[in-house]
Amino acid sequence: MMTGTIETTGNISAEKGGSIILQCHLSSTTAQVTQVNWEQQDQLLAICNADLGWHISPSFKDRVAPGPGLGLTLQSLTVNDTGEYFCIYHTYPDGTYTGRIFLEVLESSVAEHGARFQIP
């Protein structure tokens, strides 16, 4: 039975040209996290395997940095980066847990700075 829950940064916003940290946290389970996949709708951004390290998709390699931890740092944000992002936790023995983050990239400097994991 899957008892875990994923906490995410929820809905966040950031300024165009800036950076943001996408972060999820799996709690309430003793399952072992074997891998976390970061995806944006139908695209793979990155994979962090607990043992094998990171894979960054070539289309994002210049704008994505691994970490901190199992999180992902998105850099040089554009308005096109607005949308849903998913952290997919592969665990043993539970299976797969998915968390959702919605990122809004704003043109102006009125981006909210309330997100827990956001880079100023």
Epitope: D42, Q43, I47, G53, H55, P58, P66
Partner: antibody, heavy 119, light 107 residues
Framework: QVQLVQSGAEVKKPGASVKVSCKAS????????MHWVRQAPGQRLEWIGG????????SYSQKFQGRATLTVDTSASTAYMELSSLRSEDTAVYYC????????????WGQGTTVTVSS | DIQMTQSPSSLSASVGDRVTITCQAS??????LAWYQQKPGKAPKLLIY???YRYTGVPSRFSGSGSGTDFTFTISSLQPEDIATYYC?????????FGGGTKLEIK
């Protein structure tokens, strides 16, 4: 240039163990994950597992968990794959191969080591 | 485990032909797919990574496409030196798995 040079062919009896080595040169062994892939005669490639020499993490295919052991001697720039409790179905060519920097595709391969298990 | 089904298993074509090989994953793997070429008695060589990126030094006649579960590998104009077996490989999640291979022969 990057090179992965493997140890020579081995003939083993069922129940025995084999240890294959893979000497890396042309790059720093701790910078790339090393994997082991085998190919039985006429069969598809089969991933055994991988080891991250930087932090020592290992990931094994469930099929080989407990029977395969991956290690790295960073001072000798050499990776090892030991397979125990050998059976005839383990007769195959064993390859070491490294994954690209920050990618999981396998960009350099050793020449392969033939392991024959026969009584 | 993710199953990779490659087709056809063998293929005979003439020099200059356009050759297409397909690979189907048993679940969505996004673009976590590579293609390799293996000649008899030799180790595989990386041709395509992340579904569509040509590896360094690989001739432009080789290309890859696809995302999700369906992938295609194409040789735009077959050359005699392309005679080999081609494999797809998923690295979306462990255990990493390979297709059954496509053996390419010249007519």
């Amino acid at each position: 240039q990057v090179q992965l040079v493997q140890s020579g062919a081995e003939v083993k009896k069922p129940g025995a163990s084999v240890k294959v080595s893979c000497k890396a040169s042309g790059y720093t062994i701790t910078e790339n994950t090393m994997h082991w892939v085998r190919q039985a005669p006429g069969q598809r490639l089969e991933w055994i597992g991988g080891i991250n020499p930087n932090q020592g993490g290992t990931s094994y295919s469930q099929k080989f968990q407990g029977r395969a052991t991956l290690t790295v001697d960073t001072s000798a720039s050499t990776a090892y794959m030991e397979l125990s409790s050998l059976r005839s179905e383990d007769t195959a060519v064993y390859y070491c191969t490294r994954s690209s920097y920050y990618r999981y595709d396998l960009d350099y391969w050793g020449q392969g080591t033939t392991v024959t298990v026969s009584s | 485990d993710i199953q990779m089904t490659q087709s056809p298993s063998s293929l005979s074509a003439s020099v200059g032909d356009r050759v297409t090989i397909t690979c189907q994953a048993s679940q969505d793997i996004k673009t976590a797919l590579a293609w390799y070429q293996q000649k008899p008695g030799k180790a595989p060589k990386l041709l395509i990574y992340s579904a569509s990126y040509r590896y360094t030094g690989v001739p432009s006649r080789f290309s890859g496409s696809g995302s999700g579960t369906d992938f295609t590998f194409t040789i735009s104009s077959l050359q005699p030196e392309d005679i080999a077996t081609y494999y797809c490989h998923q690295h979306y999640t462990t255990p990493w798995t390979f297709g059954g291979g496509t053996k390419l022969e010249i007519k």
